[in-house]
Interface confidence: low
């Protein structure tokens, strides 16, 4: 666990977009880059390791969770789990970073269940900002319309019973007030 979050479980999954494009991780010049592209039917999809966390604090963001507690995830390529999917709030890019300390706040995403098939990932450090698809790349998207297709992702090869248990029933609908985003406060420990 880290900074007030407790690890529920971790599980591998492949990540694809609303339009069935695959999210893959390619090593180029010693660094991983993230690709979003069509994968052949017989092609093995890259997998991510998703770590699911439950925060003990009441949600300041409208994440789906258990007993009013928000559910957060962070993600690593299954082939290198010391690298984290990272929401860079300086240039609004989504990138893979290897950190010498535990993953920064930018590596945590509040999980929203959009339907029985789709989820979205809201940046913990940037409420109202989601991982989205722009020009065949992942980017940070400020999305007022939470039903927008480009922030919806499908997680496959994941235990559906677990997903159902922690994020609620498939026909779950966000309440209007739950969908409103509140200002996120940093907590200091001095």
């Amino acid at each position: 666990s880290i900074q007030g979050t407790s690890l529920l479980t971790q599980s591998p999954a492949s990540l694809s977009t609303y339009n069935d494009q695959s999210v893959s991780f390619v090593l180029e010049n010693g660094c991983y880059v993230i690709n979003v592209d069509d994968s052949g039917k017989d092609q093995e999809q890259d997998q991510v390791l998703l770590r699911y966390y439950e925060s003990p604090c009441p949600a300041s963001q409208s994440g789906d969770g258990v007993d009013g507690k928000k559910l957060m995830v962070n993600m690593s390529p299954i082939k290198d789990t010391d690298i984290w999917l990272h929401a860079n709030d300086k240039d609004y890019s989504v990138e893979l970073q290897r950190g010498d300390v535990s993953p920064p706040e930018q590596a945590f995403f509040v999980l929203h269940k959009k339907s029985s098939d789709f989820v979205s990932f809201e940046c913990k450090n940037l409420p109202g900002t989601y991982i989205g698809v722009k020009d065949n790349q992942l980017a940070l998207v400020e999305e007022k319309d939470e039903s927008c297709n480009n922030i919806m992702f499908k997680l496959s090869k994941i235990n559906p019973a677990f997903l159902y248990k922690v994020v609620g029933a498939a026909d779950y609908k966000d309440d209007d007030d739950k969908a409103a985003h509140h200002h996120h406060h940093h907590h200091h420990h001095h």
Epitope: S1, Q3, G99, H188, H189
Partner: antibody, heavy 117, light 108 residues
Framework: EVQLLESGGGLVQPGGSLRLSCAAS????????MSWVRQAPGKGLEWVSA????????YYADSVKGRFTISRDNSKNTLYLQMNSLRAEDTAVYYC??????????WGRGTLVTVSS | SYVLTQPPSVSVSPGQTARITCSGD??????AHWYQQKPGQAPALVIY???ERPSGIPERFSGSSSGTTVTLTISGVQAEDEADYYC???????????FGGGTKVTVL
């Protein structure tokens, strides 16, 4: 209140070994990344090593790689730095620090390591 | 290896404004954090994430960022602000932390 108390510093000959300890209190030690940062006399700060709660990952500055080993005992709330093959240039005050997300929010008072014959 | 560059020293009269710069190629993408160190003491955080001020730090301390340079500004400098100041950030890959060389602020 977060407290980090280093110990184990002292005078050692070149090529010798030393083990530093950092006793942590006032927070859930097992939940935080911890590091050692050093400062040679009259010089600037240098990041040395880090230990994360994630899969027990450890990281080292190039200057100490292969000679220093960071470890932690979560049951004792203690961080360690085993220093082998010490050199004169390792002479410094060694600080135990706690990370809060991407920055250091708490520092110990430091322990002096002197490598000299 | 990655380098963060700071001026070695800055001198300022009481009540004036001190500006300390920190330059590094990765700073458009990586946050910088600032630490104050007084003689014989451990460093203490004064600014994090380029511009954020921790609770307990006086309002006269502020941070800004532009391109490859971040700046720590001390407005209305007081005698107690005399100290060494260090910026810290990550290398371009995010793989390790780097400190700047430090800037000694002298209050005249």
């Amino acid at each position: 209140e977060v407290q980090l108390l280093e110990s184990g510093g002292g005078l050692v000959q070149p090529g010798g070994s030393l083990r530093l300890s950092c006793a942590a209190s006032g927070f859930t030690f097992s939940s935080y990344a911890m590091s050692w940062v050093r400062q040679a006399p009259g010089k600037g700060l240098e990041w040395v090593s880090a230990s994360t709660p994630w899969q027990g990952s450890t990281y080292y500055a190039d200057s100490v790689k292969g000679r220093f080993t960071i470890s932690r005992d979560n049951s004792k709330n203690t961080l360690y730095l085993q220093m082998n093959s010490l050199r004169a240039e390792d002479t410094a005050v060694y600080y135990c620090v706690r990370w809060y997300w991407g920055w250091i929010d708490s520092w110990g008072r430091g322990t002096l390591v002197t490598v000299s014959s | 290896s990655y380098v963060l560059t700071q001026p070695p020293s800055v001198s300022v009269s009481p009540g004036q404004t001190a500006r300390i710069t920190c330059s590094g190629d990765a700073l458009p993408k990586q946050y910088a954090h600032w630490y104050q160190q007084k003689p014989g003491q451990a460093p203490a955080l004064v600014i994090y994430k380029d511009t954020e001020r921790p609770s307990g730090i006086p309002e006269r301390f502020s941070g800004s960022s532009s391109g490859t340079t971040v700046t720590l500004t001390i407005s209305g400098v007081q005698a107690e602000d005399e100290a060494d100041y260090y910026c810290m950030s990550s290398d371009p890959s995010g793989a390790s932390r780097v400190f700047g060389g430090g800037t000694k602020v002298t209050v005249l």
